[in-house]
């Protein structure tokens, strides 16, 4: 049994940031989840963590140097990336993990999204691309 | 409280294999990684590699990937390392511990450690 | 493979002092770096998490900070059950790999 997700499948990122969307077909309310954001036809670099459960406060947090933010609803997750690179642009894919209740339950590989970074280019710091939230 | 029971010491020849089991309790088994790190006598600590239980997914270091296989029985909450072709150089304390699903960065929680000696 | 540096291997110290270990990246891991103490014997327990971030029932006197490739450990006033062996290891990419230890022995 496996969680569909819907998401746009373009977003244009003006002055480097863009919200992107992941609507899922589960209610995640009074779930232990992980909902992540993934780069690249491949998936291969995660962008973005929220991490959920019934008992804690939401958190966000990015371990490839990525800015960004998460809000939660009871059926989706919305990803607010700042500070991107022009050459960022590239798809995106939503993932959503439910650890508990048992069984463990995962998505369909969605769509996708293309982001397209227009805007300011940034001049990356060469160790630290952004502050990624604890 | 929240523990990691490991199985007892093991004497093995070169050449055969090893299994060490690693029993959780006073946590959900499903909302952690189950790692495993060895230390042989005076050396580095290393990763081996870990499971997730919720989806039996793996992840290996390179080094061990074609002689380490990790399991687990969700029914009874254990993880399993099983360590194939022993040479003397695997003799070392291997240790389980836990990451955390959703926030996986540290090892919280350890297990007593296992002594695995490999001797002819 | 991201390699973990850590010095010095050993040293000595007395009841009271501050104490300082450095661990060094070999590229960029962010915050994503974490301490261990280790007693013989006895399985390593965490001490700091995400480099700075003081674990349950650690004593303040520990305290960790740095970003990027290079961190630190300081222990602010070493007490008896302080001397054992310090690890750090990165949790940013797998595999997870750990520095080679620091000793903190009686001088």
């Known amino acids: 049994n496996k969680i569909l997700v819907k998401q746009s499948p373009m977003l244009v990122a003006y002055d480097n940031a863009v919200n992107l969307s992941c609507k899922y077909s589960y209610n995640l309310f009074s779930r232990e989840f992980r909902a992540s954001l993934h780069k690249g036809l491949d998936s291969a670099v995660e962008v973005c963590v929220v991490y959920g459960n019934y008992s804690q406060q939401l958190q966000v947090y990015s371990k490839t140097g990525f800015n960004c933010d998460g809000k939660l609803g009871n059926e989706s997750v919305t990803f607010y990336l700042q500070n991107l690179y022009v050459n960022q642009t590239d798809i995106y894919f939503c993932k959503i993990e439910v650890m508990y209740p048992p069984p463990y339950l995962d998505n369909e590989k969605s769509n996708g999204t293309i982001i397209h970074v227009k805007g300011k280019h940034l001049c990356p710091s060469p160790l630290f691309p952004g502050p990624s939230k604890p | 409280q929240v523990q990691l029971v490991q199985s007892g010491a093991e004497v093995k020849k070169p050449g055969a294999s090893v299994k060490v089991s690693c029993k959780a309790s006073g946590y959900t088994f499903t909302s952690y990684y189950i790692h495993w790190v060895r230390q042989a006598p005076g050396q580095c600590l290393e990763w081996i590699g870990c499971?997730?239980?919720?989806?039996?997914?793996?992840n290996y270091n390179e080094k061990f990937k074609d002689r380490a296989t990790l399991t687990v029985d969700t029914s009874i909450s254990t993880a399993y390392m099983e360590l194939s072709r022993l040479r003397s150089d695997d003799t070392a304390v291997y240790f389980c511990?836990?990451?955390?699903?959703?926030?996986?960065?540290?090892?919280?929680?350890w297990g007593q450690g296992t002594t695995v000696t490999v001797s002819s | 493979d991201i390699q973990m540096t850590q010095s010095p291997s050993s040293l000595s110290a007395s009841v009271g002092d501050r104490v300082t270990i450095t661990c060094h990246a070999s590229?960029?891991?962010?915050?994503?770096l974490n301490w261990y103490q280790q007693k013989p014997g006895k399985a390593p327990k965490l001490l700091i998490y995400k480099a700075s971030n003081l674990h349950t029932g650690v004593p303040s006197r520990f305290s960790g900070s740095g970003s990027g490739t290079d961190f630190t450990l300081t222990i602010s006033s070493l007490q008896p059950e302080d001397f054992a062996t310090y690890y750090c290891q990165q949790g940013q990419t797998y595999p997870y790999t750990f520095g080679c230890g620091t000793k903190v022995e009686i001088k």
């Open positions: 511990t836990r990451s955390h699903y959703g926030l996986d960065w540290n090892f919280d929680v």
């Open positions: 499971i997730y239980p919720g989806n039996v997914n793996t």
């Open positions: 590229q960029n891991i962010y915050v994503w």
